[in-house]
Amino acid sequence: LNSTVLKPSGNEDTTADSFSTSETLESLNISTLPLPEVQCFVFNGEYMNCTWNSSSEPQPTNLTLQYGYKNSDNYKVQECGHYKFSKEITSGCWLPKSEIRLYETFVVRLQDPREPRRQMEQKLKLQNLVIPWAPENLTLRNLSESQLELSWKNRYALDHCLQHLVQYRSDWDSNWTEQQVDHKQSFSLPSVDGQKLYTFRVRSRFNPLCGSAQHWSKWSHPVYWGSNISKENPWLFITKA
């Protein structure tokens, strides 16, 4: 990337922010205040929320959010079209599915409209920020006298994109036992005791085939298998397909 060095002509980009040595100390102090970090999450690929802590501002400020995608063809940013508010102050932005492109770098810019120099830009990989809905329709069936199979349904369109965490415990256990299940919607427990009541629940995350999200979905509603024959709780819970 060689070039001839050209002297500045004074014909500089007037769209960039102006700078004057006579700026007041007060405005300089405001302009150097850090802006809050923006947290964005894509919910099941259906919409995205980007939020910030509006209460971190020293005085109530309607910060503006612009966003765009960084690629080789264009780098157009647009302002949020659907702000979220907290105590009548902007605190987030809702983006519809049509604005979500998981595999391009998402750029979000937060700005104080009263102080043009006070702005912050973040880069995010949206494929690492997908949070699926909780698994649904948990079903238990006996594969044999002592073997159980748990299966469930995802509400994310691409099953292979999700890994799952199954937790189970009996009424005799104080801690959950957990098992990670990759890219399938079932889990087998080879040995169960019919005298115990078992509780099962599942959660999912967008990892690792389609993204590297660290956030899990919420837990599914639990399902139960077996019986509790203690005198204090003489009830039976059986869920079978």
């Epitope: 960084k70 780098y75 940013v77 990989k125 590297s212």
Partner: antibody, heavy 115, light 107 residues
Framework: LQESGPGLVAPSQSLSITCTVS????????VHWVRQPPGKGLEWLGV???????NYNSALMSRLNINRDNSKSQIFLKMNSLQTDDTAIYYC????????????WGQGTTVTVSS | DIVMTQSHKFMSTSVGDSITITCKAS??????VAWYQQKPGQSPKLLIY???TRHTGVPDRFTGSGSGTDYTLTISSVQAEDLALYYC?????????FGGGTKLEIK
């Protein structure tokens, strides 16, 4: 990318450095400024993004301005009230279109602040 | 501002060995970490971005990894030409910030 600067600046004076680029458009790529004092590490100064907006190093914001002339493919760094500890090599660097960091750097221009 | 800390200012290794340079961010930077190599008298060169994506033309002996606040650059089978300063940098949020650098010396 090629930087050009004054070389020597007197304390309390202003610094103007020009970065002239070729092979890409300033409306498609961000350009960053980074400096390196002698024998020390890299310090990010600021950026002018493809769309023309800017971000600055928090500690230096009050002294810095970055702007550009798209038609001449030039970016300008201006810094006020220089002190001896502003002595450094000043680099401009391009942020790639598909690379989310600084993928090409100029050779740098040495600025010495001394009376 | 996010502080990037490279705890080792100097590291020494032999040709053919493997070495790992570490970098710690003061907060989660969501894998938005780049690594640069700066040889004596030269401008920095980009090696890795987004923690693990190798830049075009970078030899595959350079590998980046990490998440959250902890990141590493591993050079497997170190070559004599790898003698350089290595800097990490977060590109998650402005202002961008660099680590203090790690100087790799060849025994």
């Amino acid at each position: 990318l090629q930087e050009s600067g004054p070389g020597l600046v007197a304390p309390s004076q202003s610094l103007s450095i020009t970065c002239t680029v070729s092979g890409f458009s300033l409306t498609s790529y961000g350009v960053h400024w980074v400096r390196q004092p002698p024998g020390k590490g890299l310090e990010w100064l600021g950026v002018i993004w493809a769309g023309g907006s800017t971000n600055y190093n928090s500690a230096l914001m009050s002294r810095l301005n970055i702007n550009r002339d798209n038609s001449k493919s030039q970016i300008f760094l201006k810094m006020n009230s220089l002190q001896t500890d502003d002595t450094a090599i000043y680099y401009c660097a391009r942020e790639g279109s598909t690379v989310d960091s600084m993928d090409y750097w100029g050779q740098g221009t040495t600025v010495t602040v001394s009376s | 501002d996010i502080v990037m800390t490279q705890s080792h200012k100097f590291m020494s290794t032999s040709v053919g060995d493997s070495i790992t340079i570490t970098c710690k961010a003061s907060q989660d930077v969501t894998t938005a970490v780049a690594w640069y190599q700066q040889k004596p008298g030269q401008s920095p060169k980009l090696l890795i971005y987004w923690a693990s994506t190798r830049h075009t033309g970078v030899p595959d002996r350079f590998t980046g990894s990490g998440s959250g606040t902890d990141y590493t650059l591993t050079i497997s089978s170190v070559q004599a030409e790898d003698l350089a300063l290595y800097y990490c940098q977060q590109h998650y949020i402005t202002p961008w910030t660099f680590g203090g650098g790690t100087k790799l010396e060849i025994k």
